[in-house]
Interface confidence: low
């Protein structure tokens, strides 16, 4: 039967069953995706817009697939095989109760059932595994697949490689609270702060718990993955995003055409091949660029190098550097610098550092 | 160019029914989540109701509930508002509305980005 | 459900003048925009979440705010700036939708 010919699939949540909380729907979905990837070399990561390999949809009766659902018990669920299209979909029968638990249909458990078809899975006849056609619920806090169920996925998709093992792209706890977590570039984007990370980045609401991960890629298609550094200028609707010796613009949230750009436009000697970092601050406009282990600050209103720069990081951010990895602006007086999975809010009005934090602390961690 | 045209408005008695259609031109209608918002002669906005992109989740204002549908058909690029057990405070032109904003970004704004030019409905015995 | 206020009702200034809206909801929202409505017409987007003008519109427009208090600023008023403005925001989950009453800009 097919299969997926390659090892990065994405899904999307087309829409949500009013069963459940929202965040239980994309908690058990992204949980029934990670079973398959602990014992494969695929990697699940959700998105949020355009076409994804994988579409999940709640709906009832006739759906438009030739496969109208039969309402409450019968089919739970369906799915199909890997392709493009409505191959790999996994369609759920909105007149069932879907729940988080032993009640009604517990979603995690269908799911991973429907995701094993969405791989390329028929069903087994071995009724501890969870291709078996009939649905039972089992505790979902001890679920293991079956040797079975494993035999016929590796069989597909061979084990997971160690040495393959990405960072984690959907965003499971272990991931976003892994205490030795860092970020390539950080930056504010009105009352948001964007966390970048290889290929992904993680967006924060201000004073709001909740923080989704996301594809660089399916927010801005033209953009690279590996975003090194990022800056803001909010009064203009402005962001910076830079890697290796180029930089995007981004206004109202839309990339700029005639980008990338070389970052030497901004004034930088040729010895200057990346940045590590970047901040702007509104209350002197200028921009503050992290290269290795020293600083230039770029006067954004007559759009030149301030003259005396480079300085050296430590000389005169105390407590920080020598290098960093990201920071941003906020509050009106802080720096965020971030150096590998530490933290450090510094207040540039008393220029010093007033606390120290994980990377993560942003994510309720 | 992205244009929406609403029609089916009209006059239409206390308790009657009416079905308003909006025709989308110009981009692709099935990408984007819809919206029907109300303007009550020299009053403000009313948001009556909104349906995703694919048709599933419809969402209406506690005013209309359980009078009013709302439904899509992606094949034809139209958007519908069947109005049933009209009231006399229903009366107000009907506006269509394109959701814009990265859907990406949805938890965190949404916007209309493309309105039509309205229809009149007035509800009077 | 969240309330929408706009003050002031109405706006009496002259061609030239700056115009300073305000919007405040009765709970904190993050995802506000801000529309203009011309007599007869059908409203327009100016500025979506919070401070991003939409496509087309000049810069004499600006949005700012957060939490509960939101302004539109008009830096100098041009004859077309004279109309009705509104404020909305959104609820997503559930979802709920509110627009404000309304500030009508006049000529003085």
């Known amino acids: 039967g097919p299969v997926w010919r390659k090892h990065y699939i994405t899904y999307r949540i087309n829409n949500y069953t009013p069963d459940m909380n929202r965040e239980d729907v994309d908690y058990a979905i992204r949980k029934a995706f990670q079973v398959w990837s602990n014992v494969t070399p695929l990697k699940f990561s959700k998105i949020n817009t355009g076409m994804a390999d994988i579409l999940v949809v709640f709906a009832r009766g006739a759906h438009g697939d030739f496969h109208a659902f039969d309402g409450k018990g019968g089919i739970l669920a369906h799915a199909f095989g890997p392709g493009s299209g409505i191959g790999g979909d996994a369609h759920f029968d909105e007149d069932e109760f879907w729940t988080t638990h032993s009640g009604g249909t517990n979603l995690f458990l269908t799911a991973v059932h429907e995701i094993g078809h969405s791989l390329g899975l028929g069903h087994s006849s071995d009724p501890k595994a969870v291709m078996f056609p009939t649905y039972k619920y089992v505790d979902i806090n001890t679920f293991r697949l079956s040797a079975d169920d494993i035999r016929g996925i590796q069989s597909l998709y061979g084990d997971p490689k160690e040495n393959q093992r990405l960072p984690n792209p959907d965003n499971s706890e272990p991931a976003l609270c892994d205490p030795n977590l860092s970020f390539d570039a950080v930056t504010t984007v009105g009352n948001k702060i964007f966390f970048f990370k290889d290929r992904f980045f993680w967006l924060k609401v201000s004073e709001r718990p909740k923080t989704s991960v996301n594809l660089i890629s399916s927010l801005w298609p033209t953009l690279p993955s590996g975003i090194e550094a990022a800056y803001e200028i909010e009064a203009r609707n402005q962001v910076f995003l830079f890697k290796d010796d180029k930089y995007w613009l981004i206004s109202n949230l839309r990339p700029e055409p005639n980008y990338p750009k070389s970052i030497h436009s901004f004034g930088f000697p040729n010895f200057v091949k990346k940045i590590d970092a970047a901040v702007f601050n509104p209350r002197f406009y200028r921009t503050y660029f992290f290269v290795d282990n020293q600083y230039w600050r770029y006067d954004e209103r007559r759009q030149m190098m301030d003259p005396g720069y480079p300085k050296l990081i430590t000389k005169n951010f105390q407590g920080i550097g020598p290098k960093i990895d990201a920071v941003f602006y906020s509050k009106n007086k802080y720096y965020y610098f971030f150096q590998g999975s530490n933290q450090f809010e510094y207040d540039f009005l008393l220029q010093r550092i007033t606390k120290t934090l994980k990377s993560n602390s942003w994510f309720g961690c | 160019e992205v244009q929406l045209l609403e029609s089916g408005g009209g006059l239409v008695q206390p308790g009657g029914s009416l079905r308003l259609s909006c025709a989308a031109s110009g981009f692709t209608f099935s990408a984007y989540e819809m919206d029907w918002v109300r303007q009550a002669p020299g009053k403000g906005l009313e948001w009556v109701s909104g349906?995703?992109?694919?048709?599933?989740?419809?969402y209406y204002a506690d005013s209309v509930k359980g009078r009013f549908t709302i439904s899509r058909d992606n094949s034809k690029n139209t958007l519908y508002l069947q109005m049933n057990s009209l009231r006399a405070e229903d009366t107000a032109v009907y506006y269509c509305?394109?959701?814009?904003?990265?859907?990406?970004?949805?938890?965190?704004?949404?916007?209309?980005?493309?309105w039509g030019k309205g229809t009149t409905v007035t509800v009077s015995s | 459900d969240i309330q929408m206020t706009q003050s002031p009702a109405t706006l009496s200034l002259s061609p030239g003048e700056r115009a300073t809206l305000s919007c405040r909801a009765s709970h904190s929202v993050d995802n506000l925009a801000w529309y203009q409505q011309q007599p007869g017409q059908a409203p327009r987007l100016l500025i979506y979440?919070?401070?991003y003008r939409a496509t087309g519109i000049p810069a004499r427009f600006s949005g700012s705010g957060s939490g509960t208090d939101f302004t539109l600023t008009i830096s100098s008023l041009e004859p077309e700036d004279f109309a009705v403005y509104y404020c909305q925001q959104r609820n997503n989950w559930p979802l709920s939708l509110t627009f404000g009453g309304g500030t009508k800009v006049e000529i003085k």
């Open positions: 349906i995703s992109s694919s048709g599933g989740p419809t």
């Open positions: 509305a394109r959701v814009g904003g990265w859907e990406l970004l949805q938890d965190y704004y949404y916007y209309m980005d493309v």
């Open positions: 979440d919070v401070s």
